[in-house]
């Protein structure tokens, strides 16, 4: 069945019905989305411009898809199952008289139904379900989803989740700072930095003294221990994790289905058996993969490995000697982790600007 593969979804009200005040329409859609977010892990954010996951519009007759509206009565609205483009969008027939009361057609009730489709729900044959195909008025102020609706939406997305249970923030123990600590992979994840080691990872907000630790399996049961490389494309909320000849995609902190995939699908030659480190440079829109003495460069726009790679790390990254454990992109610098140390590297001037202990991020 069709469902969104991410937790955080956007919506945009492309145009407004003249039947109601704009603020009433905004509030109604906010409440309609809340009906579904209250019983799932899904979260919805309203956009005022650009393409959103769920575009909402009011239209007469022909309006750009195969499903013409039929005037007053009959079809009130339609919505598409999840996916890119028109998929996920909800269309409301402007020929109806939209209201927030029992008169005309109640926008809230129809919106909850259509957004159910936008999230992947089919029609129900249970007359108590909001997904029943026939409109009937219910008092919006006392409206509740039926047990059927909750069961069906949770079969797609699960029940509401609390944030993954991470151990209480604490300052690093002094032994932590005295160790010669190396990391398997380091990457930003949103505003946080994740430091992968064996079967767990530390995470922290830069500038905050608190350090947190959790096991990989507790947050992502399908991801193995011993991650060897990681990078984030923050603008897409995508995190890529590598181990041996496989890689995983985590979208909005949720593992994507149909992964792991082979690293060879990215364009690596058969001689590459694992990736030592990876980093995404958002200014160049390139991913740099470090493999032994060489590095590869991948173009995320073209979704292709750049030609003429691999190249020698020592030639093109002056001051950097293999072998590399992990690379972090942070504030326009690369932090290249090698054993107990890290090198701060300026990619613009192509030079090492600092040598630090690998644990310097933890206030050591």
């Amino acid at each position: 069945r069709s469902r969104w593969m991410k937790r955080y979804l956007t919506y945009r009200i492309y145009n407004y019905t003249p039947d109601m005040k704009r603020e009433d329409v905004d509030y109604i859609f906010q409440k309609a989305f809340q009906v579904w977010s209250d019983v799932t892990p899904l979260r919805f954010r309203k956009l005022h411009k650009d393409e959103a996951d769920i575009m909402i519009l009011f239209a007469f007759g022909a309006h750009g898809d195969f499903n013409y509206f039929d005037g007053k009565g009959g079809t009130l609205a339609h919505a598409f199952y999840p996916g890119p483009g028109i998929q996920g969008d909800a269309h409301f027939d402007e020929a109806e008289t939209w209201t927030k009361s029992f008169q005309g057609t109640n926008l809230f009730l129809v919106a909850v139904h259509e957004l159910g489709h936008s999230l992947g729900l089919q029609h129900s044959n249970n007359p108590k379900s909001i997904m029943y195909p026939t409109y009937r008025y219910l008092n919006p102020s006392t409206f509740r989803l039926s047990a059927d609706d909750i069961r069906n939406i949770q079969s797609l997305y699960g029940a509401p989740v609390k944030p993954p249970s991470l151990t209480k923030p604490s300052s690093p123990p002094s032994t932590f700072c005295h160790q010669s600590l190396s990391f398997d992979a380091v990457t930003t994840v949103g505003e946080k930095i994740f430091f992968f080691k064996d079967w767990f990872f530390w995470w922290k907000l830069p500038g905050s003294p608190a350090t947190n630790i959790t096991s990989i399996s507790s947050i992502w049961p399908s991801i193995p221990s011993g991650i060897q490389a990681a990078y984030e494309i923050e603008s897409r909320n995508q995190l890529f994790l590598f181990k041996d000849e496989k890689y995983w995609l985590i979208n909005n902190l949720v593992p994507e289905p149909h992964y792991p995939r082979s690293i060879y699908s990215l364009g690596f030659s058969a001689s590459v058996k694992k990736v030592d480190a990876a980093v995404f440079d958002p200014l160049r829109q390139k991913v740099y993969f470090f493999v032994d003495k060489h590095y590869w460069r991948y173009d995320v726009r073209q979704e292709l490995m750049d030609p003429a790679y691999p190249k020698l790390i020592s030639t093109h990254f002056p001051g950097i000697k293999p072998k590399i454990d992990a690379v972090l992109y942070f504030k326009r610098h690369y932090y290249i982790f090698q054993g107990a140390y890290q090198l701060e590297y300026d990619p613009l001037f192509r030079r090492v600007t600092k040598t630090l202990k690998s644990t310097s991020w933890f206030g050591c």
Epitope: H63, G64, D65, F66
Partner: antibody
Framework: EVQLLESGGGLVQPGGSLRLSCAAS????????MHWVRQAPGKGLEWVSG????????MYADSVKGRFTISRDNSKNTLYLQMNSLRAEDTAVYYC???????????????WGRGTLVTVSS | DIQMTQSPSSLSASVGDRVTITCRAN??????LNWYQQKPGKAPELLIY???SLQSGVPSRFSGSGSGTDFTLTISSLQPEDFATYYC?????FGQGTKLEIK
Amino acid sequence: EVQLLESGGGLVQPGGSLRLSCAASGFTFSWYWMHWVRQAPGKGLEWVSGISPSGGMTMYADSVKGRFTISRDNSKNTLYLQMNSLRAEDTAVYYCARDIVGPYSAGLFDYWGRGTLVTVSS
Amino acid sequence: DIQMTQSPSSLSASVGDRVTITCRANQSIYTYLNWYQQKPGKAPELLIYAASSLQSGVPSRFSGSGSGTDFTLTISSLQPEDFATYYCQQAGIFGQGTKLEIK
């Protein structure tokens, strides 16, 4: 890998009939809307017909309504176009194309077959 | 009924040129416009959907914009493999096509 392979084209006399097939693989055929789009020699693209995932809903261009019938067999992953009362102006390459999942069609054709040539001539 | 008007019908350009093709609907189709590329003897291929979203695997030199009634397809720097015919489309309506030829 998504693949669509048309067959059944050929030379037919005006007034005659022909049945085109489109064998689909690499995706869950029964979830998707499917369409036929044609292209007369040296001309542009013209949408012909579409069918819902279950086969319960069909759509036709005015130019073929009443003469062409679209159908599908989800157990065989195959789309069909039965063309009756053929005219010279039906001469074209006929492509099958995949649309989206769900109860409504978007007309978003993300995968196409290579096409099969239908020639209507006496 | 909705009609799509594409212009120009043909266009000569050189490798490296920036090229723009326009498509106009006679009424609002919101952002529901797709662009296809077709090379001689081949099936069309989806380039852009929902006016501005790049189909997976399509090079980033292709971009789309517009909403409502006016839409454009832009190729930022023409490559030899881009010489082809381009169609705009919404639902069952295709534009007449724009043949892009080498100058």
